[in-house]
């Protein structure tokens, strides 16, 4: 029967008939830097290529006996999630591996930086098709590892990594804490976060998505036809680098930014119990687990968005944090969140030729997140239109005035500590969805883009009575660009995107002593282009 | 040529200490430092801790990805190396696990 | 182009031992081990094993119940197979083949048993 | 180990499509996705047709194609040649070793 693992990853209508993608990621050459790999195991010959590079630090202690099945048993195990022939994700997938990991499974960071210039210089010698890099391991946050990860992805190379098996924030590590590596978390058959020991999965923002990691079968370098049980998140990881090298073989053109879009679009969605993460962390963490995409055509015609959160800004006064896309994403809509409620807000703003998300603290506050939506958008030309606090009773309103802009977002932004509550109309006059309305006091920012076939609406949904949490989510076929909260007033902790649902937050109703009059009503802005569903449409 | 002036080279190291390898160095270089730059620098880092007595060994020299080389030295030499021309920051070596 | 070269025939008393060798050429020596495998005249192909370039590690059919030895020599990416106590229904062409997917094969070495 | 089951023989005219059949149990073909099947003409050694079940190496025809359904594999060779006339073994990964196929002989009238 198939592993618990790989039917996880299998798109439901498949499972019936054992699907197996045509090309199983032979287009792909997938790299491992991991413990050396007993690359002739029945499970993996002739799909591993072991390269002439090692840099690993001496084993520690004078007792430390080198058995060779012992020196392997990561790497393989992890050859065979990748490309195993029986109890593989991508078995047509050819893997080149790196010796960075010694025989205890440590390395150094300088080992892996050298490692990763060899990929490089291996990619500029002989350029083949696309590459995934699979980095199963983790130390502590390394500034230099994180900043050749990102030049090697500015190269066009995917790279996937293990979250990390420490119960921690992922943030904290490298090269987990990455921006441009995709990082992965590990998820049990119950859909689960893995406990390892006392420890387990890593968690947080700079977690990109969850994959099977618990009791997950694969090649045991024991013997040549072994198979052992592992955990972690390096198993994790190398799931996603098998279901990496199976889209980029069906659509060898992918960019990085397309393919992390494409890997969260095709999820599993809020299946993971998220009371197994600390309280803090909850918000922060996707509730994704990896999947296989149902066809092995793109999805071409899709608007593909995810939510990038900030680190957090700390609790000064003037403290701000900042949410970045990434640089072939467009920021369509910027939010905050405080967990104590007070902040001043957010807005987009021009940093480095690129739009930015900044979300204000504000005094007394704890601190505050910026979040970014940010979207796979071609030919987008996209600006912000400001409009200053209004002063009068109806509130701030700005809309998009140039021809063919259409509304993705809307952001508010205060320099009061406290709004007070000014309750503005909730519903837009007739004709005129390209606006963002707001509080009186604040100044109002509209997220306008310009995009082939780009055509947007606002949904909205109100409660009268005060809620902790109120939701609006987007119809099927359209994609949630922006998310807001109306009032603004300091009672609402702030608004963010889950998938295709917006998220309005509320202070405890019960220690706020709030009045009916504060009712709140969550603003989406959903999304879709014609444009990317007719060329996709052409294609078949 | 001295370090530009008003950008200061910084040093970074592992916050977890058991994780930390003092005595080896990763030096990372500006952006567009090429190879050759990166190869003179490191001369000059091992000539300069020469004169103070103490010994270096360039380990690696980077190019590709990142310019910069990889030494090992003394961590009293920090300060110095931190001073030479075109260094961005010096980040000390640390583990990595298998996961 | 990927090779396997075998040695040549051999011709064995009852009670003696064979040793067999396989010259492999125009791969990753290390990615594949080799198979051995035999075939008794006028009969079907049977698997005698498997042996590794990479770590020397063998494993045999249950049927050889320790008359055979498979060995490697990286240096010489050789591969050998010894067969012990010979007997008459050990006739037949041995062949050693790439890997467990046995997808190249050597041109077979014809072992004649007979007192 | 048992040797997989395959008829002792079967044949077909030229232009004709034939199937061999191969029959083991879920702990040898029903088991894995590595099914392979073997070509030998008199006197050479066997070459691989098929491996993993339905892959074909390169420079194999695509007259040959493999299939598989529950712990019985299939070749099928479509517009038979005179050149097809071979003996033809299957072959299946067990959880530790091998096991090939009795061998069914093909002849093209």
């Known amino acids: 029967s198939i592993p618990w693992n790989l039917e996880r990853i299998t798109p439901p209508r498949y499972r019936a008939d054992e699907y197996q993608p045509p090309d199983g990621g032979s287009l792909v050459e997938v790299y491992l830097l991991d413990t050396s790999i007993q690359s002739d195991h029945r499970e993996i010959e002739g799909r591993v290529m072991v390269t002439d590079f090692e840099n690993v630090p001496e084993e520690d202690g004078t007792r430390f006996h080198r058995q060779a099945s012992k020196c392997d048993s990561h790497g393989t195990h992890l050859a065979g999630v990748v490309s195993g022939r029986d109890a593989g994700v991508a078995k047509g997938a050819s893997m080149r591996s790196l010796r960075v990991l010694n025989c205890q499974g440590k390395g150094t960071v300088s080992g892996t930086l050298i490692g990763l210039e060899f990929i490089r210089k291996s990619q500029l010698v002989q350029p083949v098709g696309p590459l995934v890099v699979l980095l199963p391991l983790a130390g502590g946050y390394s500034r230099v590892l994180n900043a050749a990860c990102q030049r090697l992805a500015r190269a066009g190379v995917v790279l996937v990594t293990a979250a990390g098996n420490f119960r921690d924030d992922a943030c904290l590590y490298s090269p987990a804490s990455a921006p441009e590596v995709i990082t992965v978390g590990a998820t049990n058959a119950q859909d689960q976060p893995v406990t390892l020991g006392t420890l387990g999965t890593n968690f947080g923002r700079c977690v990109d998505l969850f994959a099977p990691g618990e009791d997950i079968i694969g090649a045991s370098s024991d013997c040549s036809t072994c198979f052992v049980s592992q955990s972690g998140t390096s198993q994790a990881a190398a799931h996603v680098a098998g279901i990496a090298a199976m889209m980029l073989s069906a659509e060898p053109e992918l960019t990085l930014a397309e393919l992390r879009q494409r890997l969260i679009h095709f999820s599993a969605k809020d299946v993971i119990n998220e009371a197994w993460f600390p309280e803090d962390q909850r918000v922060l963490t996707p509730n994704l687990v990896a999947a296989l995409p149902p066809s092995t055509h793109g999805a071409g015609w899709q608007l593909f968005c995810r939510t990038v959160w900030s680190a957090h800004s700390g609790p000064t006064r003037m403290a701000t944090a900042i949410a970045r896309c990434a640089p072939d994403e467009e920021l369509l809509s910027c939010s905050s969140f405080s967990r104590s409620g007070k902040r001043r807000g957010e807005r987009m703003e021009a940093q480095g030729g690129k739009l930015v998300c900044r979300a204000h603290n504000a005094f007394g506050g704890e601190g505050v997140y910026a979040i970014a939506r940010c979207c796979l958008l071609p030919q987008a030309n996209c600006s912000v239109h400001t409009a200053p606090p209004a002063e009068a009773s109806m509130g701030t309103r700005v809309h998009c005035h140039q021809q063919g802009h259409v509304l993705t977002g809307c952001s508010s932004h205060w320099e009061v500590e406290d709004l007070g509550t000014h309750k503005p109309p909730v519903l837009r006059p007739r004709g005129q969805p390209n606006q963002c309305v707001g509080h009186r006091e604040a100044s109002i920012h509209a997220s306008c883009c310009h995009a082939p076939g780009l055509e947007c609406k606002v949904k909205e949904h109100g409660i009268p009575a005060p809620q902790e949490q109120v939701t609006v989510a987007c119809e099927e076929g359209w994609t949630l660009t922006g998310c807001s909260a109306l009032p603004g007033t300091s009672h609402v902790l702030g608004a963010y995107a889950v998938d295709n649902t917006c998220v309005v937050r509320s202070r405890d109703v019960s220690t706020t002593g709030s009045t009916s009059e504060e009712a709140v009503t969550a603003v989406a802005i959903c999304c879709r282009s014609r444009h990317l569903a007719q060329a996709s449409q052409e294609l078949q | 040529e001295a370090p530009e002036h008003g950008t200061t080279a910084t040093f970074h190291r592992c916050a977890k200490d058991p994780w930390r390898l003092p005595g080896t160095y990763v030096v990372v270089l500006k952006e567009e430092t090429h190879l050759s730059q990166s190869e003179r620098t490191a001369r000059r880092l091992q000539a300069q801790a020469a004169r103070r007595g103490y010994l270096t060994k360039i380990l690696h020299v980077f190019h590709g990805l990142l310019p910069g080389f990889l030494v090992k030295m003394s961590g009293d030499l920090l300060e110095l190396a931190l001073k030479l021309p075109h260094v961005d920051y010096i980040e000390e070596d640390s583990s990595v696990f298998a996961q | 182009q990927v090779q396997l070269v075998q040695s040549g025939a051999e011709v064995k008393k009852p009670g003696a031992s064979v040793k067999v060798s396989c010259k492999a050429s125009g791969y990753t020596l290390t990615s594949y081990g080799i198979s051995w495998v035999r075939q008794a005249p006028g009969q079907g192909l049977e698997w005698m094993g498997w042996?590794?370039?990479?770590?020397?590690?063998?494993n045999y059919a249950q049927k050889l119940q320790g008359r055979g030895t498979m060995t490697t020599d990286p240096s010489t990416s050789t591969a050998y197979m010894e067969l012990r106590s010979l007997r008459s229904d050990d006739t037949a062409v041995y062949y050693c083949?790439?890997?467990?997917?046995?997808?190249?094969w050597g041109q077979g070495t014809t072992v004649t048993v007979s007192s | 180990q048992s040797a997989l089951t395959q008829p002792a023989s079967v044949s077909g005219s030229p232009g004709q499509s034939i199937t061999i059949s191969c029959t083991g149990t879920?702990?040898?073909?029903?088991?894995?996705?590595?099914v392979s099947w073997y070509q030998q003409h008199p006197g050479k050694a066997p070459k691989l047709m098929i491996y993993e079940v339905s892959n074909r190496p390169s420079g194999v025809s695509n007259r040959f194609s493999g299939s598989k359904s529950g712990n019985t594999a299939s070749l099928t060779i479509s517009g038979l040649q005179a050149e097809d006339e071979a003996d033809y073994y299957c072959?299946?990964?067990?959880?530790?070793?091998?096991?090939f196929g009795g061998g069914t002989k093909l002849t093209v009238l």
């Open positions: 042996v590794s370039f990479y770590n020397g590690n063998t």
């Open positions: 083949a790439r890997g467990y997917g046995m997808d190249v």
């Open positions: 879920s702990s040898d073909v029903g088991g894995y996705n590595s």
């Open positions: 072959n299946s990964y067990t959880s530790t070793s091998m096991v």
